[in-house]
Interface confidence: medium
Amino acid sequence: SSSDACGPCVPASCPALPRLGCPLGETRDACGCCPVCARGEGEPCGGGAAGRGHCAPGMECVKSRKRRKGKAGAAAGGPATLAVCVCKSRYPVCGSNGITYPSGCQLRAASLRAESRGEKAITQVSKGTCEQGPSIVTPPKDIWNVTGAKVFLSCEVIGIPTPVLIWNKVKRDHSGVQRTELLPGDRENLAIQTRGGPEKHEVTGWVLVSPLSKEDAGEYECHASNSQGQASAAAKITVVDALHEIPLKKGEGAQL
């Protein structure tokens, strides 16, 4: 074992630690004698060689087949297998700043960086990704088309947990009071489709209207909700009698 090569512990002969100390704290060398800087993620560990200290809290020393390409040791032509420090908790965690970190070790690193800048430390709020209210990634676009046409509106939303997406038709009576009608209702010419994605925690929904009738004209709202909140976006469907009535002005955002 590495301790076989350890002579008597003479603290006076230990190399000095950096004057500013170690960002991940101190630990003892392989012989348990001299204080050394604790190793961080991807840094060499274990073994009896001088300077091969132990990993920081929350990390473990794991043999790696890869060489530390472009990192310390590569220049010295290190061994083909190398023990490096890796994070014990390799699952995402939610920080007190609302940011999700791939591991607790990366959150700790970010916290130390923040503190070094004179900012507040970041603590772990929960395991898993941080929850966030829905937001509209791609809102539906206004549509102009003729009676009898096939048209669709689409809406892409994101949130954690993954939001629930619904469609409403917004109606206003003569006095301007707004009412919403949950779609599809009993409309035979209207279909709603929802699928997960394209990205994680995203949902995409479509309203398909076929054939389009005058009664379908109006404002359609895409509404997303989860435990953290809600978001919505709306688009208008305008039904005309003939194609030449459709404005084709640039930048109007209307589509056929």
Partner: nanobody, 127 residues
Framework: VQLQESGGGLVQTGGSLRLSCAAS??????????MGWFRHAPGKEREFLTA????????YYTDSVKGRSTISRDNAKNTVYLQLNNLKPEDTAVYYC???????????????????WGQGTQVTVSS
């Protein structure tokens, strides 16, 4: 091994500068080195300002620049940067970058701890 600073110049009080330090040299693995920035004002000792570990994961700032400077590095470009904001006349000095071989996350602050030094870049802050 060569360290070359750039980005210095004359700037008004309250202004900003971004200093760069490009490393080059045969068999010099930039990502194996902790980096630091120092400055030297006339009639004063060389003053340590900030340090960054080999990986760029950890940074250290002294009180004189904390809150108004950011050290960063790009190991692919063999370059370390120092962003200086809200500059004051007392920031006038020659700014130096320095490199120290380090396989671990550690900070180095003394002139004697660093192995390689740049030639420096002049920063002048006018009131």
């Amino acid at each position: 091994v060569q360290l070359q600073e750039s980005g210095g110049g004359l700037v008004q009080t309250g202004g900003s500068l971004r200093l760069s330090c490009a490393a080059s040299g045969r068999s010099f693995t930039f990502s194996s080195y902790a980096m630091g920035w120092f400055r030297h004002a006339p009639g004063k000792e060389r003053e340590f300002l900030t340090a960054i570990t080999w990986s760029g994961d950890y940074t250290y700032y002294t009180d004189s620049v904390k809150g108004r400077s950011t050290i960063s590095r790009d190991n692919a470009k063999n370059t370390v940067y120092l962003q200086l904001n809200n500059l004051k006349p007392e920031d006038t000095a020659v700014y130096y970058c320095a490199a120290k071989f380090s396989q671990v996350s550690a900070f180095f602050a003394t002139v004697s701890e660093y192995e390689y030094w740049g030639q420096g870049t002049q920063v002048t802050v006018s009131s």
